[in-house]
C-alpha cells in the first residue's frame, strides 16, 4: 500500500477537531475516521465503536467493526480510525489459509517427533524428526507426549470477516 | 465469501413501478456495505445508489434521486431497490454488488462480490 499523509502531516487550520462531526473535504478526501458526504461537500465522522476508516478516503460510509468470535480474545476496540484486534484464544490458532476460525492447536507430538515450537495465537506446535530435524506438519497419527502449550504475546490483527 | 442473486426485473410501462431484490447467501451480509449499479445496452456500468452495513446511510445517482428508493434487511439478509416514476432510460441489467464500503464515483472498496443482474425494460 502506497505512504498516506496522516492527519498530523496537515496545517493546523486543515485539521478536523476531535469532536467535529463534519469537516470539509481536502483535496476531495477526508481523513482517517471520517467519510465523504453523498454531495462530497462534508467529511462525516465515524460512529465510534461502530464504525472506522483508516486513511485518507472518498468513501461514502466508514467500513463496519469487527466483532470478536467467539474463541476470540479482543486485544483493542475499535476506534473510529482502527478496527478491532481479536486474537485466537490460548490453547487455539489461526492459519494463514482459513483465517475465519481458530483452530485448537496439537497437544503434542507424534511418535519419532519432538516439540521445536509452542502454540502461539497464529501458529501451531511445531515438530521436527527426532534425527533428521525436517518438520512436521498436518494431523497427529499418535501422541508421544502431551505438551502443555503456552500462547504468544504479539497481536494479529482480525480479518474483516467477522 | 458471499453469493448474491437479483430478482424483480420486468417489463413495465412508463411511468410504472418495480421492485428488485437482492438476496445473499453467507452469514456476513451485515458487514458489507451494498450497491445497485446499472447496465442500458451498449452503455457503460453506472453507479445507481449504495446503502451502509446498518443501513441508515444512502446515496442515489441524480439521475435516479427522489425516484429510486434502496433499503435492505439484514435479518432476511436481502438488499432492495423500489423504482418508481420509470422511464425508457432507466431500461437496462440491473446488479446488486457487496463491498466494504463504496467510492462516490462507484468504486468498491475492499473484497467484493458481484450478482449476475436482471432485466428491467421500460416501455409503452
Known amino acids: 500500500e502506497s505512504a498516506l499523509i496522516t492527519q498530523q502531516d496537515l496545517a493546523p487550520q486543515q485539521r478536523a477537531a476531535p469532536q467535529q462531526k463534519r469537516s470539509s473535504p481536502s483535496e476531495g478526501l477526508c481523513p482517517p475516521g471520517h467519510h465523504i458526504s453523498e454531495d462530497g461537500r462534508d467529511c462525516i465522522s465515524c460512529k465510534y465503536g461502530q464504525d472506522y476508516s483508516t486513511h485518507w478516503n472518498d468513501l461514502l460510509f466508514c467500513l463496519r467493526c469487527t466483532r470478536c468470535d467467539s474463541g476470540e480474545v479482543e486485544l483493542s476496540p475499535c476506534t473510529t480510525t482502527r478496527n478491532t484486534v481479536c486474537q485466537c484464544e490460548e490453547g487455539t490458532f489461526r492459519e494463514e489459509d482459513s483465517p475465519e476460525m481458530c483452530r485448537k492447536c496439537r497437544t503434542g507430538c507424534p511418535r519419532g517427533m519432538v516439540k521445536v515450537g509452542d502454540c502461539t495465537p497464529w501458529s501451531d506446535i511445531e515438530c521436527v524428526h527426532k534425527e533428521s530435524g525436517t518438520k512436521h506438519s498436518g494431523e497427529v497419527p499418535a501422541v508421544e507426549e502431551t505438551v502443555t502449550s503456552s500462547p504468544g504475546t504479539p497481536a494479529s490483527p482480525c480479518s474483516l470477516s467477522g | 465469501e458471499v453469493q448474491l442473486l437479483e430478482s424483480g426485473g420486468g417489463e413495465v410501462q412508463p411511468g410504472g413501478s418495480l421492485r428488485l431484490s437482492c438476496a445473499a447467501s453467507?452469514?456476513?451480509?451485515?458487514?458489507?456495505?451494498m450497491s445497485w449499479f446499472r447496465q442500458a445496452p451498449g452503455k457503460g456500468l453506472e453507479f445507481v445508489s449504495a446503502?451502509?452495513?446498518?443501513?441508515?446511510?444512502?446515496y442515489y445517482a441524480e439521475s435516479v434521486k427522489g425516484r429510486f428508493t434502496i433499503s435492505r434487511d439484514n435479518a432476511k439478509n436481502t438488499l432492495y431497490l423500489q423504482m418508481s416514476s420509470l422511464r425508457a432510460e432507466d431500461t437496462a441489467v440491473y446488479y446488486c454488488?457487496?463491498?466494504?464500503?463504496?467510492?462516490?464515483?462507484?468504486?468498491?472498496?475492499?473484497?467484493?462480490?458481484w450478482g449476475q443482474g436482471t432485466l428491467v425494460t421500460v416501455k409503452p
Open positions: 454488488a457487496s463491498a466494504e464500503s463504496f467510492s462516490r464515483g462507484g468504486l468498491p472498496y475492499g473484497m467484493n462480490y
Open positions: 453467507g452469514r456476513t451480509f451485515t458487514n458489507y456495505a
Open positions: 446503502i451502509n452495513w446498518s443501513g441508515d446511510s444512502t
